[in-house]
């Protein structure tokens, strides 16, 4: 009678993570008597995967009933496959011995490869906001994919970026891999509504890449431009001075009026108007009773935007050299929260 052979018909098996792998194995004879074991890897460092004789194998089931007398099918199924299960599996026949069973014959091995999807890319931007014309870095990370081959692209508002560096780790063989990429983006004043997108393509995604996004609104700071203007006289001896705060982002802004260097009023931007590009405009105004002043008045609009050092714009209010009228420094009309009378 011919000597027993252990046949593993599949040289390789490819399984998606989460699925069940079937590893086929048959013996050509019932003799010699003894159990079958499955191992991952060869040599002394191999891992025992399934033992017909004893043990507990929550994820492993046999394809056929190994207790049946004439059974020669020793195929197994491994459930809920993960990239960590990748490797070469050997079906090994043991001959009954005393005190220990003795390894008799091994199959040629089946290489189990696991295809695992990359995790959703996570894009993160700089910790602090930056202003237009500055270059900022964005990082994109995705983990847990196999095989190693992967493609990563960067886009800003649909336009592909070219200034980026990508690494896939580890460099050598591994059960799964990670990708890390850093892209450099130059900010413009129009970027409040812009998006940076990291796109990852992998064989497991069937042509439907994964995307991670970052909104530049989280990254950009557009400093305001200031303009102080004197409006036509509203009433006798009264001048309306406005401070136009334009094109700023984010909204966090505090404005202080100074009269000849002394603080007159401080207010926080509330009812702002939004521009098409996502920046904001705001206007504050001050009602000045010029008859209360003998000398010229220097009015300063000082703005602190998003915690940055204050910027300011001044306006010199000319006081004409007419004699003060009686009672001109008594209460002037105060028609709104943004008005201020000088006495």
């Amino acid at each position: 009678e011919e000597e027993l052979q252990v046949i593993q018909p599949d040289k390789s098996v490819l399984v998606a993570a989460g699925e069940t792998a079937t590893l086929r194995c048959t013996a050509t004879s019932l003799i010699p008597v003894g159990p079958i074991q499955w191992f991952r890897g060869a040599g002394p460092g191999r891992e025992l995967i399934y033992n017909q004789k004893e043990g507990h194998f929550p994820r492993v089931t046999t394809v056929s009933d190994l207790t049946k007398r004439n059974n020669m099918d020793f195929s197994i199924r491994i459930g809920n496959i993960t990239p960590a299960d990748a490797g070469t599996y050997y079906c090994v026949k043991f001959r009954k011995g005393s005190p220990d069973d003795v390894e008799f014959k091994s199959g040629a091995g089946t290489e189990l490869s696991v295809r695992a999807k990359p995790s959703a890319p996570v894009v993160s931007g700089p910790a602090a906001r930056a202003t237009p014309q500055h270059t900022v870095s964005f990082t994109c990370e995705s983990h847990g994919f196999s095989p190693r081959d992967i493609t990563l692209k960067w886009f800003k508002n649909g336009n592909e970026l070219s200034d980026f560096q990508t690494n896939v780790d580890p460099v050598g063989e591994s059960v799964s891999y990670s990708i890390h990429s850093t892209a450099k983006v130059v900010l413009t004043r129009e970027d409040v509504h812009s998006q940076v997108i990291c796109e990852v393509a992998h064989v497991t995604l069937q042509g439907d890449p994964l995307r991670g996004t970052a909104n530049l609104s989280e990254t950009i700071r557009v400093p305001p431009t200031l303009e102080v203007t004197q409006q036509p006289v509203r009433a006798e001896n009264q001048v309306n001075v406005t401070c136009q705060v334009r094109k700023f982002y984010p909204q966090r802004l505090q404005l202080t009026w100074l009269e000849n260097g002394n603080v007159s009023r401080t207010e926080t931007a509330s009812t702002v108007t939004e521009n098409k590009d996502g920046t904001y405009n705001w206007m504050s105004w001050l009602l000045v009773n010029v008859s209360a002043h003998r000398d010229d008045v220097k009015l300063t609009c000082q703005v602190e935007h998003d915690g940055q050092p204050a910027v300011s714009k001044s306006h010199d209010l000319k006081v004409s050299a007419h004699p003060k009228e009686q009672g001109s420094n008594t209460a002037a009309e105060n028609t709104g929260s943004n008005e201020r009378n000088i006495y």
Partner: nanobody, 124 residues
Framework: QVQLQESGGGVVQAGDSLRLSCVAS????????MGWFRQAPGKEREFVAG????????YYADSMKGRFTISRDNAKNLVYLQMNSLKPEDTAVYYC?????????????????WGQGTQVTVSS
Amino acid sequence: QVQLQESGGGVVQAGDSLRLSCVASERTFSSLDMGWFRQAPGKEREFVAGISRSGISQYYADSMKGRFTISRDNAKNLVYLQMNSLKPEDTAVYYCAAALTFRGSNLPRDSNYWGQGTQVTVSS
């Protein structure tokens, strides 16, 4: 050289549960079969439970089957032994073991590396 440190032992009542932990110093922990042995006063050290390096296969001594569960966390270099429905006869020093030696298809009865042990006392 693999260094093993057990923790989680103590004194419990019969019927109680206890979870033992063992942390390994080895960076290649995921390439080591791990297990637990125990030694009661005046007795030989005996195999309790073993787990293969990926955790796919587990082995239990007959008297522990159904009551004890071995598990591992390769990311943290940890192996656990969850012991339920403890009996006074489970009183022993429990040892963590690494690189189990399997002979043929028998349960492991040896190891290359041992921890210092943690005392488990089950009072009736």
